[in-house]
Interface confidence: medium
């Protein structure tokens, strides 16, 4: 989650928080994560940390859905303190907001080493396939916050560990884009509650993982249909009539193009879109807003003010995506411009560090796409051609010298405009 900085408040998941304000983050598909506390610090940074639970000195500690740590029965809060979030009904059982439970039969492709973990959040049931670690003991035990059984003493799976061999299954690498992380930046190997992080950070790529690969978290959203009348489905505040299809818009990830939901009477059914392994062309290309790659020749979704004669080509020249990231911290602005190329398949990242208008540092990194997809804050800004990129880099060399000795206000922003391709008029290429 990109955090915007300001003297008086913090921005987190499109919500404003006052300095000193504390909250539990809302993470799809788990809902409110009570075991993480976030605070808005004075410098506008959001700091999140895992709740450390004290040892409880009783034989049967009780788990309360809206509290992270187990409590002894005699120290429970009075009933009227109960959080008044919407409960969920699933298979005839009512679950409180924040409650985790196990479901059977939701996923046809469930592997023997997987179980279905569900959680109730704001009246919706979120379920995911969780791949369980191989057990090395004869008598595994059940734990309250996981559908996987564990060996005694192994129950604590913390975000601080960075050895992700259990939960980070790489089967469909397209789907392994990290979602934009806040400042606690848990390693990609462990996620909230031990479930793999929901994929699809940058919506122009990535998808839910292929359930046949038995990896990642395959999410099935079962809407609580109580109080809903008529043949409609409600998703993300929008109403859909029976038979209508849409791409879900998940709070932390934006629109997930690789999932298609259909309204079936009053129940939304969501399916992963399967992209072909092979394409009839040599270099199929990714279009923003589309799940699968498209062969040149099929009309592209145009970026504002740009015209491509066929997919990915501008005036006969191949185009490549350009990403931008601007991050401000402690009066320093780090601006990154990244060009993704297919031959060689890498991402060229140009990094500018500016303090009080003076260029402090400029360097270029060539990184793998895998590494790029794990970097937060990047947004697709345009597509450009190699010739425009060459003009950009030449201009960049000039202003990198110029701006290291005098204050520059808009030079870099102006230079970035070179990368935007003008709408072509016939015969004016």
């Amino acid at each position: 989650e990109q955090v915007k900085h300001s003297e008086t408040y913090c921005m987190f998941q499109d919500k404003k928080y006052r300095v000193g304000e504390r909250w539990h983050p809302y993470l799809e598909p788990y809902g409110l994560v009570y075991c993480v506390n976030c605070i808005c610090s004075e410098n506008g940074n959001v700091l999140c940390s895992r709740v450390r639970c004290p040892n409880v000195h009783c034989l049967s500690p009780v788990h309360i859905p809206h509290l992270c740590c187990p409590r002894c029965p005699d120290s429970l809060p009075p009933v009227n303190n109960k959080v008044t979030s919407k409960s969920c009904e699933y298979n005839g059982t009512t679950y409180q907001h924040g409650e985790l439970f196990v479901a059977e039969g939701l996923f046809q492709n469930r592997q023997p080493n997987q179980c279905t973990q569900c959680s109730c959040s704001e009246g919706n049931v979120y379920c995911g396939l969780k791949t369980c670690p191989k057990l090395t003991c004869a008598f595994p035990v059940s734990v309250p916050d996981s559908c996987c059984r564990v060996c005694r003493g192994d129950g604590e799976l913390s975000w601080e560990h960075s050895d992700g061999d259990i939960f980070r299954q790489p089967a469909n690498r397209e789907a392994r884009h990290s979602y934009h992380r806040s400042h606690y930046d848990p390693p990609p190997s462990r996620q909230a509650g031990g479930l793999s992080r929901f994929p699809g950070a940058r919506s122009h790529r990535g998808a839910l993982m292929d359930s046949q690969q038995a990896s990642g978290t395959i999410v099935q959203i079962v809407i609580n249909n109580k109080h809903k009348h008529g043949q409609v489905c409600v998703s993300n505040g929008k109403t859909y009539s029976h038979g209508e299809s849409w791409h879900p818009n998940l709070r932390a990830f934006g629109i997930v193009e690789c999932v298609l939901c259909t309204c079936n009477v009053t129940k939304q059914e969501c399916k992963k879109i399967h992209c072909p392994n092979r394409y009839p062309c040599k270099y199929p290309q990714k279009i923003d807003g589309k799940c699968c790659k498209v062969c040149p020749g099929k009309k592209a979704k145009e970026l504002p003010g740009q015209s491509f004669d066929n997919k990915g080509y501008f005036c006969g020249e191949e185009t490549m995506p350009v990403y931008e990231s601007v991050f401000m911290e402690d009066g320093e602005t780090t601006r990154k411009i990244a060009l993704e190329t297919e031959r060689p398949p890498q991402v060229e990242v140009h990094v500018w560090t500016i303090r009080k208008g003076i260029l402090q540092h400029f360097h270029i990194e060539k990184i793998s796409k895998r590494m790029f997809e794990e970097l937060p804050h990047f947004k697709l800004v345009t597509r450009t051609t190699l010739s425009q990129w060459k003009i950009f880099t030449e201009g960049e060399a000039q202003i990198s010298q110029m701006c290291s000795s005098r204050v520059c206000r808009t030079e870099l922003e102006d230079l970035v405009k070179v990368l935007y391709l003008e709408r072509s008029e016939k015969g004016h290429c």
Epitope: D165, R168, A171, E365, K369, R370
Partner: antibody, heavy 121, light 108 residues
Framework: EVQLQQSGPELVKPGASVKISCKAS????????MNWVKQSPEKSLEWIGE????????TYNQKFKAKATLTVDKSSSTAYMQLKSLTSEDSAVFYC??????????????WGTGTTVTVSS | EIVLTQSPALMAASPGEKVTITCSVT???????LHWYQQKSQTSPKPWIY???NLASGVPVRFSGSGSGTSYSLIISSMEAEDAATYYC?????????FGAGTKLELK
């Protein structure tokens, strides 16, 4: 030219530890995952684990979790692997290997020169 | 973990002969996640074929790869002396990443 230069051969006593290095050159070190692979006559090639040089985040093969520790030094573009409590079964050639990392293909596109570790009393 | 079984373990081929090395996988994997490496004595492995059928840089066109699901092959259309080496298949479909035991190809 992209190169991974590994440290020289090691002769160590059982129970001891050893730390081998892999110096990267010719590319952005923090831009590609680094993997470690063990090659022994009995077991052929075995993947030990990977490290993200940018964050230091690691993923291990469960089998080597208690045996190997992967680290990096970004300033010198060097990856390290420490092996502890060595036994004769740990005698092998160890390779570092770069993850090509460009979807949809993920494979080891550049391999290190290899470090031979011999455990003997 | 996914186990890769290569066959044959050892084989000899004459110059000009067609060679096929197979790699059998214990569970279905996507073809983009199956790779082949070549290793000659006393040297490091080299990427040879990636994503089932794509030749790595500098690999002669007499090499090809095919397969899907659980069965994959490396093919040499016409054996040459420089092809004598050990070939390993490897999967990158799920952790831990695993390799086949290798096929040693000798020149007859």
């Amino acid at each position: 030219e992209v190169q991974l230069q590994q440290s020289g051969p090691e002769l160590v006593k059982p129970g001891a530890s050893v730390k081998i290095s892999c110096k990267a050159s010719g590319y952005t070190f923090t831009g590609y995952y680094m993997n470690w692979v063990k090659q022994s006559p009995e077991k052929s090639l075995e993947w030990i684990g990977e490290i993200n040089p940018r964050t230091g985040g690691t993923t291990y093969n469960q089998k080597f979790k208690a045996k190997a520790t992967l680290t990096v030094d970004k300033s010198s573009s060097t990856a390290y692997m420490q092996l502890k409590s060595l036994t004769s079964e740990d005698s092998a050639v160890f390779y570092c290997a770069r993850d090509y990392g460009s979807s949809p293909y993920w494979y080891f596109d550049v391999w290190g020169t290899g470090t031979t570790v011999t455990v003997s009393s | 973990e996914i186990v890769l079984t290569q066959s044959p373990a050892l084989m000899a081929a004459s110059p000009g002969e067609k060679v096929t090395i197979t790699c059998s996988v214990t569970s279905n994997i996507t073809s983009s996640n199956l790779h082949w490496y070549q290793q000659k004595s006393q040297t490091s492995p080299k990427p040879w074929i990636y994503g089932t059928s794509n030749l790595a840089s500098g690999v002669p066109v007499r090499f090809s790869g095919s397969g899907s699901g659980t069965s994959y092959s490396l093919i040499i259309s016409s054996m040459e002396a420089e092809d004598a080496a050990t070939y390993y298949c490897q999967q990158w479909s799920s952790y831990p990443l695993t390799f086949g035991a290798g096929t040693k190809l000798e020149l007859k």
